[in-house]
């Protein structure tokens, strides 16, 4: 009777677009059939996907966040079979160019400008922004209550990913029209 | 969670056929080992056909040459055509799925169907 398997990786937490992966389904055994699934399917037919030593052996190339999914192995011979646990692929991705909210650029003076900064990042980046070029606080929002037409002028949020060892960022133009004016958005 | 469902039995004379089919729902895996047992009044389950990953089948020996198990992976249906039924024969018959151990074990499947009587007369 064939026992439980289990797999085992080289790389547990691989990079997007830069590492591959070997998924390896223990233990090898005589006269056994290995086979894989991916979120309970078959596999997909993929150039980036290489079963080798006979096919006790998944190999995926330039991995992408799309493969953050749950593989299985599965062995099996003329009287028993058995299927491992699920291990799901860790994929380090990111950052992602960030998104500013809200979209609008023209506020009236003494509104709260509140802006939040987000980037698909694994894991989550950490957040800074600057205005005008200078440094800010190093948080995924910003806020300045009762904002005056000093406050015009760019504001860059900066995103980094320390596991993948990536940044990226965003500048948004705010400009702040005093009161009795009528910008093209008010907040 | 897997859902089984049985359909195909009934009442049949001996030398007749019936073709039973098991249908599989739920957190399912392609191409999954999906085996048919039956079990008489006053009787354990016995296994009675296996179909595995690669589609191999087993039987027990009483019903080879009788008896065949066949999966239609779109529908993710398995089947069990059974011909020249014997008096024998009558049981109710379950499917099963989610196996981790002998194909012919019971206790190695997880998830099972509430089963489909089949009678044979003489």
């Known amino acids: 009777e064939l026992p439980k398997p289990s797999i085992s990786s080289n790389n547990s937490k691989p990079v997007e677009d830069k590492d591959a992966v070997a998924f390896t389904c223990e233990p090898e055994a005589q006269n056994t059939t290995y086979l894989w699934w991916v979120n309970g399917q078959s596999l997909p037919v993929s150039p980036r996907l290489q079963l080798s030593n006979g096919n006790r052996t998944l190999t995926l190339f330039n991995v992408t966040r799309n493969d953050a999914r749950a593989y299985v192995c599965g062995i099996q011979n003329s009287v028993s079979a058995n299927r491992s646990d699920p291990v799901t692929l860790d994929v380090l991705y990111g950052p992602d160019t960030p998104i500013i909210s809200p979209p609008d650029s023209s506020y009236l003076s003494g509104a709260n400008l509140n802006l939040s900064c987000h980037s698909a990042s694994n894991p989550s980046p950490q957040y800074s922004w600057r205005i005008n070029g200078i440094p800010q606080q190093h948080t995924q929002v910003l806020f300045i209550a009762k904002i005056t037409p000093n406050n015009n002028g760019t504001y860059a949020c900066f995103v980094s990913n320390l596991a993948t060892g990536r940044n990226n960022s965003i500048v948004k133009s705010i400009t702040v029209s005093a009161s009795g004016t009528s910008p093209g958005l008010s907040a | 969670e897997v859902q089984l469902v049985e359909s195909g039995g009934g009442l049949v004379q001996a030398g007749g056929s019936l073709r039973l089919s098991c249908a599989a729902s739920?957190?399912?895996?392609?191409?999954?080992?999906m085996g048919w047992f039956r079990q008489a009044p006053g009787k354990e389950r016995e296994f009675v056909a296996v179909i595995n990953w690669t589609d191999s089948t087993y039987y027990l020996d009483s019903v080879k040459g009788r008896f065949t198990i066949s999966r239609e992976n779109a529908e993710n249906t398995v089947y069990l055509q059974m011909n020249s039924l014997k008096p024998e024969d009558t049981a109710i018959y379950y499917c099963?799925?989610?196996?981790?151990?002998?194909?012919?074990?019971?206790?190695?499947?997880?998830?099972w169907g509430q089963g489909t009587q089949v009678t044979v007369s003489s």
């Open positions: 099963a799925t989610g196996i981790g151990g002998l194909y012919r074990r019971p206790s190695a499947y997880k998830y």
């Open positions: 739920g957190r399912t895996f392609s191409r999954d080992v």
